[in-house]
């Protein structure tokens, strides 16, 4: 099912243009900004979503770094180069010929350079830590119930297999969701943890990417879980290469 047939829309990506011009008059949807055909039965790649977002730019965001190897998206929004499969190209450059290497979630993992900069491979982000703070509640959430609801959310809303949700930690009011997915573990058809994390990030900001589906309504035993802030840390299979100047 490439898209909803009735009114020809893309349930998993509202940043698309859809028309019944696929094989046999089937609904086909293309991502804004790139024109790449997307599979509307699953999440659209973060690269294509960022590219689409640049046609309606919003404020960039800034996160903090918890340790020497964890990366955060300090650079905010940029118009990325995506490969034909919708993945980030290893090397990204801006209009002024400034270039840098990114990981599989599009976060810069080297110092910026010029057009001579080489990025030999797209390094996989295999571990994502989503750090949330929830709004005050009368009492703490039951950890087991919270864990179950978050695992179900990632499975049912983002189609991420439960085996990739490594852990859910909770110390009121902080919730940490650990996603792990090595290259060897990711089978064809599996949602990428980077894409799931991006959809989740947009959801908790009230910027849902889903078409015609309600916004995120997360409840634990009927009690709403409202997120105050989100920090996302990315760990790559190969540590990033920054100069010492950046680390001080």
């Amino acid at each position: 099912h490439t898209a909803a047939q009735d009114n020809c829309t893309c349930p998993t990506n509202k940043m698309t243009v859809c028309s019944p011009d696929g094989p046999g008059g089937r609904c086909q949807c293309r991502a804004l900004g790139s024109g790449v055909a997307v599979d509307c039965s699953t999440l659209t790649s973060k690269c294509l979503l960022l590219k689409a977002r640049m046609s309606a730019p919003k404020n960039a965001r800034t996160l903090v770094r918890p340790n020497e190897h964890a990366l955060v998206d300090n650079d905010g929004l940029y118009d990325p180069d995506c490969d034909p499969e919708g993945r980030f190209k290893a090397r990204q450059c801006n209009q002024t010929s400034v270039c840098w290497c990114v990981n599989s979630v599009g976060v810069r993992r080297t110092d910026k350079g010029d057009l001579s900069l080489r990025c030999d491979e797209l390094v996989r982000t295999h571990h994502i830590l989503i750090d949330l703070r929830h709004r005050p509640t009368a009492s703490a959430f039951n950890h087991s119930d919270l864990d179950a609801e978050l695992r179900r959310l990632f499975r049912e809303r983002y189609r991420l297999h439960p085996k990739f949700v490594a852990a859910v930690h909770y110390e009121q009011p902080t919730i940490q969701i650990e996603l792990r997915q090595n290259t060897s573990q990711k089978a064809a058809g599996d949602v990428d943890i980077g894409d799931a994390a991006y959809y989740f990030e947009r959801d908790v900001k009230g910027e849902s990417l889903f078409q015609g589906r309600g916004g995120l309504d997360l409840r634990v035993r009927g009690e709403p879980l409202q997120v105050e802030r989100t920090l996302i840390y990315y760990l790559d299979e190969i540590p990033p290469k920054f100069s010492m100047k950046r680390l001080t």
């Epitope: 099912h1 864990d147 179900r152 049912e156 297999h161 439960p162 085996k163 058809g189 589906r213």
Partner: antibody, heavy 118, light 109 residues
Framework: QSLEESGGDLVQPGASLTLTCKAS????????ILWVRQAPGKGLEWIGC???????TYYANWAKGRFAISKTSSTTVTLQMTSLTAADTATYFC?????????????WGPGTLVTVSS | YDMTQTPASVSEPVGGTVTIKCQAS??????LAWYQQKPGQPPKLLIY???DLESGVPSRFKGSGSGTEYTLTISDLECADAATYYC????????????FGGGTEVVVK
């Protein structure tokens, strides 16, 4: 690849009973196990589910509190039932999802019969 | 999420066509399965994702629908098709009373 239920029995009203689902030929970590029951001559009734990876459990609204699903080893899942009544008389099936993120049940055990009667 | 299945029973001659309908109380985004069950046996998955045939299932079985309305059509009925058929929403395990429809008994004359 197979699933097999065991533990079905004739029990008195008010009793408790634990059923076991044994998996063989596949890695349970890649799947969820669901329990479904069927009263004699009636339809299928979904009881609950466990994500084997992580161990999270989910129940039908009517089953919450009286039924508990848990993983007891790398190849077994149990269904604990308490305060049994005649209405719980049924064949109990365990089933496996297809390894995707949906809940399509492509492998079932043969079922085990639970009879609640005085 | 509740599933309403109709009719409860249907009888058709060999070579005929049977249509079974299933309605979900909310949109289940095509995440619907159809099962066939014969007496004394566990259910067997026939169709998943509303219209995809499970391996080994004859193409006489056809699933369709979207949103909240789904249909199973069995054409060129054979005696072996006599069974009870169930739909199941495969979208969520949260806040449900039963993931299955009530079942449809198909009698082949």
């Amino acid at each position: 690849q197979s699933l097999e239920e065991s533990g079905g029995d004739l029990v008195q009203p008010g009793a408790s009973l634990t059923l076991t689902c044994k998996a063989s030929g596949f890695d349970l970590n890649n799947y969820s196990i669901l329990w479904v029951r069927q009263a004699p001559g009636k339809g299928l009734e979904w009881i609950g589910c466990i994500y084997f990876s992580g161990g999270s459990t989910y129940y039908a609204n009517w089953a919450k509190g009286r039924f508990a699903i848990s993983k007891t080893s790398s190849t077994t899942v149990t269904l604990q039932m308490t305060s049994l009544t005649a209405a719980d008389t049924a064949t109990y099936f365990c089933a496996r999802d297809d390894g995707t993120t949906s809940y399509y049940l492509n492998l079932w055990g043969p079922g085990t019969l639970v009879t609640v009667s005085s | 999420y509740d599933m309403t299945q109709t009719p409860a029973s249907v009888s058709e001659p060999v070579g005929g066509t049977v249509t079974i309908k299933c309605q979900a109380s909310e949109d289940i985004y095509n995440l619907l399965a159809w099962y066939q069950q014969k007496p004394g046996q566990p259910p067997k998955l026939l169709i998943y994702a509303a219209s995809d045939l499970e391996s080994g299932v004859p193409s006489r079985f056809k699933g369709s629908g979207s949103g909240t309305e789904y249909t199973l059509t069995i054409s060129d009925l054979e005696c072996a098709d006599a069974a009870t058929y169930y739909c199941q929403q495969a979208y969520t395990v949260g806040n449900i009373d039963n993931a299955f429809g009530g079942g449809t008994e198909v009698v082949v004359k």
